[in-house]
Amino acid sequence: LRLLDHRALVCSQPGLNCTVKNSTCLDDSWIHPRNLTPSSPKDLQIQLHFAHTQQGDLFPVAHIEWTLQTDASILYLEGAELSVLQLNTNERLCVRFEFLSKLRHHHRRWRFTFSHFVVDPDQEYEVTVHHLPKPIPDGDPNHQSKNFLVPDCEHARMKVTTPCMSSGSLWDPNITVETLEAHQLRVSFTLWNESTHYQILLTSFPHMENHSCFEHMHHIPAPRPEEFHQRSNVTLTLRNLKGCCRHQVQIQPFFSSCLNDCLRHSATVSCPEMPDTPEPIPDYMPLW
Protein backbone atom coordinates (compact mmCIF):
# COMPACT_ATOMS: atom_id res chain seq x y z
CA LEU A 1 0.00 0.00 0.00
CA ARG A 2 1.28 3.45 -0.86
CA LEU A 3 0.19 6.94 -1.81
CA LEU A 4 0.34 8.12 -5.38
CA ASP A 5 3.14 10.64 -6.07
CA HIS A 6 3.71 11.91 -2.56
CA ARG A 7 3.39 15.52 -3.71
CA ALA A 8 1.47 18.16 -1.75
CA LEU A 9 -1.90 16.61 -0.94
CA VAL A 10 -4.76 19.05 -0.59
CA CYS A 11 -7.91 18.88 1.51
CA SER A 12 -8.69 22.60 1.82
CA GLN A 13 -11.86 23.94 0.27
CA PRO A 14 -13.78 27.23 0.42
CA GLY A 15 -14.56 27.91 4.05
CA LEU A 16 -12.09 25.37 5.42
CA ASN A 17 -8.33 25.47 5.90
CA CYS A 18 -7.12 21.84 5.94
CA THR A 19 -3.87 19.89 5.58
CA VAL A 20 -3.19 16.20 4.81
CA LYS A 21 -0.70 14.47 7.10
CA ASN A 22 0.81 11.01 7.37
CA SER A 23 -0.81 9.01 10.14
CA THR A 24 0.24 6.07 12.29
CA CYS A 25 -3.42 4.92 12.26
CA LEU A 26 -3.43 5.55 16.03
CA ASP A 27 -4.87 9.00 16.58
CA ASP A 28 -4.04 10.84 19.77
CA SER A 29 -7.74 10.88 20.70
CA TRP A 30 -7.58 7.10 21.36
CA ILE A 31 -5.10 7.75 24.14
CA HIS A 32 -6.56 11.02 25.42
CA PRO A 33 -10.35 10.77 24.91
CA ARG A 34 -12.36 14.00 24.61
CA ASN A 35 -15.73 14.68 26.15
CA LEU A 36 -17.35 16.06 23.01
CA THR A 37 -16.87 14.18 19.73
CA PRO A 38 -18.40 14.56 16.26
CA SER A 39 -20.93 12.22 14.63
CA SER A 40 -19.96 9.68 11.97
CA PRO A 41 -19.43 10.31 8.26
CA LYS A 42 -22.44 10.04 5.97
CA ASP A 43 -22.74 8.41 2.51
CA LEU A 44 -19.23 6.96 2.30
CA GLN A 45 -18.53 6.02 -1.33
CA ILE A 46 -15.50 4.09 -2.58
CA GLN A 47 -14.86 4.08 -6.30
CA LEU A 48 -12.11 2.80 -8.54
CA HIS A 49 -10.42 5.65 -10.36
CA PHE A 50 -7.28 5.79 -12.47
CA ALA A 51 -4.56 8.38 -11.99
CA HIS A 52 -1.30 9.24 -13.72
CA THR A 53 1.92 9.79 -11.82
CA GLN A 54 4.24 12.66 -12.68
CA GLN A 55 6.25 10.12 -14.70
CA GLY A 56 3.18 9.29 -16.79
CA ASP A 57 2.46 5.86 -15.29
CA LEU A 58 -1.21 4.93 -14.84
CA PHE A 59 -2.33 3.41 -11.53
CA PRO A 60 -5.66 2.30 -10.07
CA VAL A 61 -6.55 4.36 -7.00
CA ALA A 62 -9.31 4.24 -4.40
CA HIS A 63 -11.45 7.35 -4.71
CA ILE A 64 -12.93 7.98 -1.26
CA GLU A 65 -15.82 10.39 -0.84
CA TRP A 66 -18.06 11.21 2.09
CA THR A 67 -20.26 13.97 3.48
CA LEU A 68 -20.91 15.36 6.95
CA GLN A 69 -24.14 15.00 8.83
CA THR A 70 -25.97 18.27 9.33
CA ASP A 71 -25.85 18.37 13.11
CA ALA A 72 -24.14 20.62 15.65
CA SER A 73 -21.33 18.12 16.19
CA ILE A 74 -19.42 19.62 13.27
CA LEU A 75 -18.44 22.32 15.77
CA TYR A 76 -16.26 19.66 17.44
CA LEU A 77 -14.93 18.06 14.24
CA GLU A 78 -11.14 18.50 14.11
CA GLY A 79 -10.43 16.33 11.11
CA ALA A 80 -10.68 12.80 9.73
CA GLU A 81 -8.54 9.67 9.60
CA LEU A 82 -8.67 7.71 6.34
CA SER A 83 -7.56 4.11 6.62
CA VAL A 84 -7.09 1.50 3.88
CA LEU A 85 -6.60 -2.11 4.97
CA GLN A 86 -5.51 -4.74 2.42
CA LEU A 87 -7.44 -7.77 3.60
CA ASN A 88 -5.14 -10.61 2.51
CA THR A 89 -1.99 -9.10 4.06
CA ASN A 90 -3.45 -7.03 6.92
CA GLU A 91 -1.30 -4.14 5.71
CA ARG A 92 -2.81 -0.78 6.64
CA LEU A 93 -2.07 2.75 5.47
CA CYS A 94 -3.59 5.87 6.96
CA VAL A 95 -3.65 9.59 6.33
CA ARG A 96 -5.15 12.33 8.46
CA PHE A 97 -7.11 15.38 7.40
CA GLU A 98 -6.27 18.07 9.95
CA PHE A 99 -8.69 20.98 10.02
CA LEU A 100 -6.87 24.22 10.73
CA SER A 101 -10.05 26.26 10.99
CA LYS A 102 -13.43 25.66 12.59
CA LEU A 103 -16.20 24.26 10.41
CA ARG A 104 -19.36 26.30 10.07
CA HIS A 105 -22.71 25.31 8.62
CA HIS A 106 -23.18 26.69 5.15
CA HIS A 107 -25.80 26.40 2.42
CA ARG A 108 -24.28 23.19 1.00
CA ARG A 109 -23.52 19.93 2.77
CA TRP A 110 -19.81 19.57 3.48
CA ARG A 111 -18.21 16.97 1.13
CA PHE A 112 -14.68 15.54 1.23
CA THR A 113 -12.71 13.45 -1.26
CA PHE A 114 -9.33 11.73 -1.40
CA SER A 115 -7.94 9.83 -4.40
CA HIS A 116 -4.32 9.05 -3.56
CA PHE A 117 -4.34 5.49 -2.19
CA VAL A 118 -2.83 3.23 -4.88
CA VAL A 119 -4.60 -0.16 -4.98
CA ASP A 120 -3.45 -3.41 -6.55
CA PRO A 121 -5.25 -5.53 -9.14
CA ASP A 122 -7.36 -8.40 -7.76
CA GLN A 123 -7.04 -7.24 -4.14
CA GLU A 124 -9.74 -6.55 -1.58
CA TYR A 125 -9.61 -3.56 0.74
CA GLU A 126 -11.52 -2.25 3.72
CA VAL A 127 -11.73 1.54 3.61
CA THR A 128 -12.61 3.38 6.82
CA VAL A 129 -13.21 7.06 7.45
CA HIS A 130 -13.01 8.02 11.13
CA HIS A 131 -14.05 11.47 12.25
CA LEU A 132 -11.70 13.05 14.80
CA PRO A 133 -11.52 13.13 17.68
CA LYS A 134 -12.50 9.47 18.03
CA PRO A 135 -15.23 8.68 20.56
CA ILE A 136 -14.70 7.87 24.23
CA PRO A 137 -14.48 4.09 24.91
CA ASP A 138 -18.25 3.60 25.33
CA GLY A 139 -19.29 6.34 22.94
CA ASP A 140 -21.20 5.85 19.71
CA PRO A 141 -18.85 4.95 16.85
CA ASN A 142 -18.07 7.85 14.54
CA HIS A 143 -16.64 6.00 11.58
CA GLN A 144 -17.93 4.32 8.41
CA SER A 145 -16.33 1.40 6.55
CA LYS A 146 -16.77 -0.28 3.19
CA ASN A 147 -15.16 -3.28 1.53
CA PHE A 148 -14.02 -2.94 -2.03
CA LEU A 149 -12.61 -5.49 -4.50
CA VAL A 150 -10.36 -4.25 -7.32
CA PRO A 151 -10.77 -6.10 -10.66
CA ASP A 152 -7.88 -8.22 -11.91
CA CYS A 153 -5.72 -7.55 -14.97
CA GLU A 154 -8.12 -9.27 -17.38
CA HIS A 155 -10.55 -6.39 -16.87
CA ALA A 156 -10.55 -4.12 -19.93
CA ARG A 157 -9.81 -0.91 -18.02
CA MET A 158 -7.28 -2.48 -15.65
CA LYS A 159 -5.36 -4.12 -18.49
CA VAL A 160 -3.77 -0.82 -19.53
CA THR A 161 -2.61 0.24 -16.06
CA THR A 162 1.12 0.19 -15.34
CA PRO A 163 1.03 -2.69 -12.78
CA CYS A 164 -0.96 -4.87 -15.20
CA MET A 165 1.15 -4.03 -18.23
CA SER A 166 4.24 -4.82 -16.16
CA SER A 167 2.85 -8.30 -15.52
CA GLY A 168 2.17 -8.91 -19.21
CA SER A 169 -1.51 -8.01 -19.48
CA LEU A 170 -1.26 -6.81 -23.10
CA TRP A 171 -0.06 -10.21 -24.34
CA ASP A 172 -2.93 -12.25 -25.76
CA PRO A 173 -1.54 -15.70 -26.63
CA ASN A 174 -4.82 -16.89 -28.23
CA ILE A 175 -4.09 -20.48 -27.16
CA THR A 176 -5.51 -23.34 -29.21
CA VAL A 177 -5.25 -26.97 -28.14
CA GLU A 178 -6.21 -29.95 -30.28
CA THR A 179 -6.12 -33.64 -29.51
CA LEU A 180 -4.14 -35.76 -31.97
CA GLU A 181 -3.99 -39.50 -32.47
CA ALA A 182 -1.54 -41.60 -30.44
CA HIS A 183 -2.10 -39.73 -27.15
CA GLN A 184 -0.78 -36.35 -28.20
CA LEU A 185 -1.85 -32.72 -27.84
CA ARG A 186 -0.89 -29.92 -30.19
CA VAL A 187 -0.61 -26.57 -28.43
CA SER A 188 -0.40 -23.39 -30.45
CA PHE A 189 -0.03 -19.84 -29.14
CA THR A 190 1.13 -16.38 -30.21
CA LEU A 191 4.54 -15.23 -29.02
CA TRP A 192 4.98 -11.75 -27.51
CA ASN A 193 7.43 -9.14 -28.79
CA GLU A 194 10.21 -9.98 -26.34
CA SER A 195 13.14 -12.40 -26.42
CA THR A 196 12.12 -14.37 -23.38
CA HIS A 197 11.46 -18.02 -22.73
CA TYR A 198 8.08 -19.61 -21.98
CA GLN A 199 6.94 -22.68 -20.10
CA ILE A 200 3.99 -24.89 -20.96
CA LEU A 201 2.47 -26.61 -17.95
CA LEU A 202 0.20 -29.53 -18.75
CA THR A 203 -2.04 -30.97 -16.05
CA SER A 204 -4.44 -33.81 -16.85
CA PHE A 205 -7.44 -34.89 -14.80
CA PRO A 206 -9.96 -37.75 -14.81
CA HIS A 207 -13.40 -36.91 -16.23
CA MET A 208 -15.21 -35.49 -13.20
CA GLU A 209 -12.37 -35.19 -10.70
CA ASN A 210 -10.02 -32.43 -9.61
CA HIS A 211 -6.94 -34.39 -8.56
CA SER A 212 -4.43 -34.70 -11.38
CA CYS A 213 -3.50 -37.97 -13.06
CA PHE A 214 -0.64 -36.58 -15.17
CA GLU A 215 1.62 -33.51 -15.10
CA HIS A 216 4.22 -32.38 -17.61
CA MET A 217 6.34 -29.27 -18.12
CA HIS A 218 7.70 -28.17 -21.50
CA HIS A 219 10.30 -25.41 -21.96
CA ILE A 220 10.18 -23.11 -24.98
CA PRO A 221 13.38 -21.16 -25.64
CA ALA A 222 13.34 -17.40 -26.23
CA PRO A 223 12.22 -16.56 -29.79
CA ARG A 224 14.32 -14.53 -32.21
CA PRO A 225 13.02 -11.04 -33.15
CA GLU A 226 11.71 -12.28 -36.52
CA GLU A 227 9.53 -14.78 -34.62
CA PHE A 228 7.82 -12.13 -32.46
CA HIS A 229 4.00 -12.23 -32.81
CA GLN A 230 4.28 -15.54 -34.71
CA ARG A 231 2.52 -18.73 -33.68
CA SER A 232 4.53 -21.30 -31.76
CA ASN A 233 3.42 -24.92 -32.17
CA VAL A 234 4.31 -27.63 -29.66
CA THR A 235 3.28 -31.28 -29.59
CA LEU A 236 2.99 -32.83 -26.14
CA THR A 237 2.86 -36.57 -25.52
CA LEU A 238 0.32 -37.72 -22.95
CA ARG A 239 0.47 -40.68 -20.61
CA ASN A 240 -1.61 -43.56 -21.92
CA LEU A 241 -3.95 -43.65 -18.93
CA LYS A 242 -7.56 -44.62 -19.51
CA GLY A 243 -9.88 -41.90 -18.26
CA CYS A 244 -7.09 -39.32 -17.82
CA CYS A 245 -8.78 -37.23 -20.47
CA ARG A 246 -9.32 -33.64 -19.29
CA HIS A 247 -6.26 -31.52 -20.01
CA GLN A 248 -5.41 -28.03 -18.73
CA VAL A 249 -2.66 -26.26 -20.64
CA GLN A 250 -1.12 -23.24 -18.96
CA ILE A 251 1.44 -20.97 -20.60
CA GLN A 252 3.79 -19.09 -18.33
CA PRO A 253 5.88 -16.29 -19.87
CA PHE A 254 9.02 -14.89 -18.28
CA PHE A 255 8.91 -11.27 -19.45
CA SER A 256 11.65 -8.95 -18.16
CA SER A 257 9.10 -6.72 -16.40
CA CYS A 258 7.60 -9.51 -14.28
CA LEU A 259 10.11 -12.42 -14.40
CA ASN A 260 8.61 -15.37 -12.43
CA ASP A 261 5.42 -13.51 -11.62
CA CYS A 262 3.86 -12.85 -15.03
CA LEU A 263 0.19 -13.42 -15.78
CA ARG A 264 -0.43 -16.96 -17.02
CA HIS A 265 -2.95 -17.94 -19.67
CA SER A 266 -4.65 -21.29 -19.87
CA ALA A 267 -6.93 -23.41 -22.03
CA THR A 268 -8.76 -26.62 -21.22
CA VAL A 269 -9.64 -29.67 -23.32
CA SER A 270 -12.65 -31.56 -22.02
CA CYS A 271 -13.04 -35.31 -22.06
CA PRO A 272 -14.73 -36.64 -25.21
CA GLU A 273 -18.46 -37.18 -24.96
CA MET A 274 -19.30 -40.76 -24.08
CA PRO A 275 -21.99 -42.25 -26.36
CA ASP A 276 -24.98 -43.54 -24.41
CA THR A 277 -24.65 -47.34 -24.49
CA PRO A 278 -28.00 -49.13 -24.34
CA GLU A 279 -28.64 -51.59 -21.53
CA PRO A 280 -27.81 -55.16 -22.67
CA ILE A 281 -30.88 -57.35 -23.06
CA PRO A 282 -30.53 -60.62 -21.13
CA ASP A 283 -30.66 -63.74 -23.29
CA TYR A 284 -32.85 -65.47 -20.75
CA MET A 285 -35.90 -64.36 -18.80
CA PRO A 286 -35.49 -64.46 -15.02
CA LEU A 287 -38.21 -66.40 -13.26
CA TRP A 288 -38.88 -63.84 -10.54
Epitope: S145, K146, F148, L149, E154
Partner: nanobody
Framework: EVQLVESGGGLVQPGRSLRLSCAAS????????MHWVRQAPGKGLEWVSG????????GYAEPVKGRFTISRDNAKNSLYLQMNSLRVEDTALYYC????????????????????WDQGTLVTVSS
Protein backbone atom coordinates in the same frame (compact mmCIF):
# COMPACT_ATOMS: atom_id res chain seq x y z
CA GLU B 1 -28.16 5.62 -22.00
CA VAL B 2 -28.01 2.90 -19.34
CA GLN B 3 -30.95 0.50 -19.34
CA LEU B 4 -31.61 -2.38 -16.94
CA VAL B 5 -34.81 -4.34 -17.51
CA GLU B 6 -35.85 -7.00 -14.99
CA SER B 7 -38.20 -9.91 -15.68
CA GLY B 8 -39.21 -13.25 -14.23
CA GLY B 9 -41.17 -12.17 -11.18
CA GLY B 10 -44.59 -13.53 -10.30
CA LEU B 11 -46.82 -15.15 -7.71
CA VAL B 12 -45.42 -18.37 -6.28
CA GLN B 13 -46.12 -20.66 -3.33
CA PRO B 14 -43.65 -20.99 -0.44
CA GLY B 15 -40.94 -23.56 -1.15
CA ARG B 16 -41.12 -23.08 -4.92
CA SER B 17 -38.54 -21.48 -7.25
CA LEU B 18 -38.28 -18.49 -9.58
CA ARG B 19 -35.53 -17.24 -11.87
CA LEU B 20 -35.16 -13.50 -12.35
CA SER B 21 -33.38 -12.03 -15.39
CA CYS B 22 -32.01 -8.60 -16.09
CA ALA B 23 -31.16 -7.37 -19.60
CA ALA B 24 -28.56 -4.60 -19.61
CA SER B 25 -27.67 -2.09 -22.31
CA UNK B 26 -26.09 1.32 -22.75
CA UNK B 27 -22.80 0.55 -20.98
CA UNK B 28 -19.95 -1.98 -21.07
CA UNK B 29 -21.70 -4.69 -19.08
CA UNK B 30 -18.58 -6.87 -18.80
CA UNK B 31 -16.68 -4.10 -16.97
CA UNK B 32 -19.08 -3.64 -14.05
CA UNK B 33 -20.07 -5.56 -10.97
CA MET B 34 -23.83 -6.12 -10.76
CA HIS B 35 -26.21 -6.62 -7.86
CA TRP B 36 -29.75 -7.55 -6.96
CA VAL B 37 -31.51 -5.42 -4.36
CA ARG B 38 -35.09 -5.67 -3.15
CA GLN B 39 -37.71 -3.56 -1.47
CA ALA B 40 -40.38 -5.28 0.63
CA PRO B 41 -43.72 -3.48 1.02
CA GLY B 42 -43.27 -0.52 3.37
CA LYS B 43 -39.55 -1.18 3.85
CA GLY B 44 -36.30 0.33 2.56
CA LEU B 45 -33.94 -1.05 -0.07
CA GLU B 46 -32.13 -4.25 0.96
CA TRP B 47 -29.07 -5.67 -0.79
CA VAL B 48 -29.67 -9.29 -1.84
CA SER B 49 -26.66 -10.44 -3.85
CA GLY B 50 -23.74 -9.20 -5.92
CA UNK B 51 -21.38 -10.53 -8.56
CA UNK B 52 -18.05 -9.15 -9.77
CA UNK B 53 -17.45 -8.09 -13.38
CA UNK B 54 -16.31 -11.55 -14.53
CA UNK B 55 -18.36 -13.70 -12.15
CA UNK B 56 -15.25 -14.61 -10.16
CA UNK B 57 -16.67 -13.29 -6.91
CA UNK B 58 -20.23 -13.48 -5.55
CA GLY B 59 -21.84 -12.40 -2.30
CA TYR B 60 -25.19 -12.96 -0.61
CA ALA B 61 -27.15 -11.32 2.19
CA GLU B 62 -27.57 -13.58 5.21
CA PRO B 63 -31.35 -14.21 4.74
CA VAL B 64 -30.88 -15.64 1.21
CA LYS B 65 -27.59 -17.57 1.60
CA GLY B 66 -27.90 -21.16 0.40
CA ARG B 67 -31.22 -20.48 -1.36
CA PHE B 68 -30.42 -17.85 -4.01
CA THR B 69 -27.75 -18.04 -6.72
CA ILE B 70 -26.55 -15.06 -8.72
CA SER B 71 -24.94 -15.49 -12.15
CA ARG B 72 -24.20 -13.49 -15.27
CA ASP B 73 -23.64 -14.04 -18.98
CA ASN B 74 -21.41 -11.27 -20.31
CA ALA B 75 -21.90 -12.42 -23.90
CA LYS B 76 -25.65 -11.80 -23.51
CA ASN B 77 -25.36 -8.70 -21.28
CA SER B 78 -27.56 -10.49 -18.78
CA LEU B 79 -27.75 -10.94 -15.02
CA TYR B 80 -29.72 -13.72 -13.30
CA LEU B 81 -31.00 -14.61 -9.85
CA GLN B 82 -32.09 -18.21 -9.24
CA MET B 83 -34.37 -18.17 -6.19
CA ASN B 84 -35.08 -21.54 -4.56
CA SER B 85 -37.04 -22.48 -1.41
CA LEU B 86 -38.86 -19.17 -1.51
CA ARG B 87 -40.36 -17.83 1.72
CA VAL B 88 -43.17 -15.38 2.41
CA GLU B 89 -40.57 -12.87 3.63
CA ASP B 90 -38.94 -12.89 0.17
CA THR B 91 -41.97 -10.98 -1.15
CA ALA B 92 -40.61 -7.74 -2.59
CA LEU B 93 -39.92 -5.68 -5.66
CA TYR B 94 -36.56 -6.94 -7.02
CA TYR B 95 -34.23 -4.55 -8.81
CA CYS B 96 -31.17 -5.23 -10.88
CA UNK B 97 -28.45 -2.68 -10.03
CA UNK B 98 -25.20 -1.59 -11.63
CA UNK B 99 -22.24 -0.66 -9.49
CA UNK B 100 -21.38 2.99 -10.10
CA UNK B 101 -17.67 2.32 -10.06
CA UNK B 102 -15.57 -0.38 -11.74
CA UNK B 103 -14.74 -2.08 -8.43
CA UNK B 104 -16.95 -4.53 -6.54
CA UNK B 105 -18.47 -3.47 -3.23
CA UNK B 106 -18.07 -6.73 -1.36
CA UNK B 107 -19.76 -5.92 1.94
CA UNK B 108 -23.41 -5.62 2.87
CA UNK B 109 -23.44 -1.80 3.17
CA UNK B 110 -23.33 -1.32 -0.57
CA UNK B 111 -26.69 -0.29 -1.94
CA UNK B 112 -26.00 3.45 -1.80
CA UNK B 113 -23.27 2.97 -4.44
CA UNK B 114 -25.60 1.48 -7.06
CA UNK B 115 -27.50 2.80 -10.02
CA UNK B 116 -31.04 1.41 -10.28
CA TRP B 117 -32.70 2.19 -13.57
CA ASP B 118 -35.93 0.24 -13.98
CA GLN B 119 -39.25 -0.44 -12.32
CA GLY B 120 -38.14 -3.79 -10.93
CA THR B 121 -39.97 -7.10 -11.03
CA LEU B 122 -42.46 -8.08 -8.32
CA VAL B 123 -42.03 -11.40 -6.51
CA THR B 124 -44.97 -12.44 -4.35
CA VAL B 125 -44.62 -15.54 -2.19
CA SER B 126 -47.97 -16.59 -0.77
CA SER B 127 -49.94 -19.76 -0.17
Amino acid sequence: EVQLVESGGGLVQPGRSLRLSCAASGFNFDEYAMHWVRQAPGKGLEWVSGISWNGGRVGYAEPVKGRFTISRDNAKNSLYLQMNSLRVEDTALYYCAKERSLGYCSGGSCSDGFDIWDQGTLVTVSS
